[in-house]
């Protein structure tokens, strides 16, 4: 099943997020991703945990997963590089870089997103955008078109409370509020964008969604700038 969903959001404006990627397994949407360079998509490491024997591809330039669109193109993956410290049983270091088989054809609907390199927390309360093709309600309805939601960043101390994530949120992670509007497992690997800059990647650990006491968890890309640069080099 797809990993993740946007809850309480709405359909995104078509192709207004040209960095948005669908990481696909055997032709079906699996996870979100974000184009960070012409030939590289950033996603979540856990997305490929169960993909050992399947064919992993990346869809760029899409709004609808099923309908033909001039900008849509499916790319094979030349190389998948999970963060070396990512592990199946933790949310830490949940990043994955996918090298496309060739450089993406750039245009209005396909464009890399600048990512945050300054290792400083986003201010609590900042509204950030998260998008994905995950299911849109608790009944499991999967959208065909890209969904998005605006979420306020939550301070780490609140996120670390026992009734929230009980100390699991390290300096390399950030949280966003989850009161009915939320990202979830299936949106894993997708971008959290604040002020037009990629700040976080949706983690793919299992988590109840849409419950305000269980905020969404995002990997802070700035904390992994050295690793990202070393892989892209």
């Amino acid at each position: 099943p797809p990993r993740g969903r946007i809850l309480g959001g709405r359909e995104a404006e078509a192709h207004a997020r040209p960095y948005m990627a669908s990481v696909q397994l055997n032709g079906a949407h699996l996870c979100g991703g974000v184009l960070v360079a012409e030939q590289w998509v950033l996603s979540a490491a856990h997305c490929l945990e169960d993909a050992a024997d399947g064919k992993v591809q990346v869809l760029l330039g899409a709004h609808s997963l099923s309908q033909p669109e001039p900008s849509k193109r499916l790319y094979d993956v030349l190389r998948a590089v999970p963060h070396p410290d990512s592990q199946p049983d933790t949310i830490d270091h949940d990043l994955l870089l996918l090298q496309l088989s060739e450089k993406a054809t750039l245009g209005p609907a396909v464009r890399p997103l600048p990512w945050q390199r300054v290792d400083r927390d986003v201010a609590p309360g900042t509204l950030c955008d998260v998008a994905g093709w995950g299911i849109v309600n608790h009944a499991g309805r999967r959208p065909d078109s890209l969904q998005h939601v605006l979420l306020p960043v939550l301070d780490r101390a609140t996120c670390n409370r026992r009734t929230h994530h009980d100390g699991a949120i390290t300096e390399r992670l950030m949280c966003a509020e989850s009161n009915r509007r939320d990202s979830c497992k299936g949106d894993s690997g997708g971008p959290l964008v604040c002020g037009g800059v990629l700040e976080g990647v949706v983690t793919s650990g299992s988590r109840v969604c849409g419950n305000r006491k269980k905020p969404g968890i995002y990997t802070r890309v700035a904390s992994y700038a050295a690793w990202i640069d070393s892989v892209l080099a």
């Epitope: 609590p124 301070d155 780490r156 101390a157 609140t158 670390n160 409370r161 026992r162 009734t163 994530h165 009980d166 100390g167 699991a168 949120i169 300096e171 109840v208 419950n211 006491k213 269980k214």
Partner: antibody, heavy 116, light 112 residues
Framework: EVHLQQSGPELVKPGASVKISCKAS????????KNWMRQRHGESLEWIGD????????NYNQKFKGKATLTVDKSSSTAYMELRSLTSEDSAVYYC?????????WGQGTLVTVSA | DVLMTQTPLSLPVSLGDQASISCRSS???????????LEWYLQKPGQSPNLLIY???NRFSGVPDRFSGSGSGTDFTLKISRVEAEDLGVYYC?????????FGGGTKLEIK
Amino acid sequence: EVHLQQSGPELVKPGASVKISCKASGYTFTDFYKNWMRQRHGESLEWIGDINPNNGGTNYNQKFKGKATLTVDKSSSTAYMELRSLTSEDSAVYYCAREGPSFAYWGQGTLVTVSA
Amino acid sequence: DVLMTQTPLSLPVSLGDQASISCRSSQTIVHSNGDTYLEWYLQKPGQSPNLLIYKVSNRFSGVPDRFSGSGSGTDFTLKISRVEAEDLGVYYCFQGSHVPPTFGGGTKLEIK
């Protein structure tokens, strides 16, 4: 290594106030709530309240409202608790504890003795 | 406030014996998020409390596997399979699901 260092013992007169401190080290101070507990001699623990070091937001046990005031100084990574209008009933050991995970990290305790 | 009642008050044991401490809450301590925030702490003489168990049955890192927690709803138990000398002290249950959080009255584990 996470460490919470509390201020030393206090001997105070009835009606006076006292401010005790809890200095955090070994982690980012603003990433975790600070909680305060009271333990009278030979008794169990009582939760006084907690504070978010990011914005100074507090929650108090109704029992301690008007008695305890929690504050933080981010620049020195220190949490404070002021106790006012002290009586002999307030004589106890006071603990600070970091919340997350649970109360895994505690200060060593500050003994406050209220005596004329 | 949620009242946490521990029994027994005092528990004399011989080293190597099993010990069992009960904790009962005056109302269910299942949080609105579905989790149960029931914890166990050990306070040795002259020391601060130490976290042993969180969320009913999860051992905190470094806690020996002779300690185990169980229960649900309003009834909870801490078991020590083979008591060692370093286990002596006062054990407290704690609920963090409702405000204000509350501790049990304590159970003193001592040598018989």
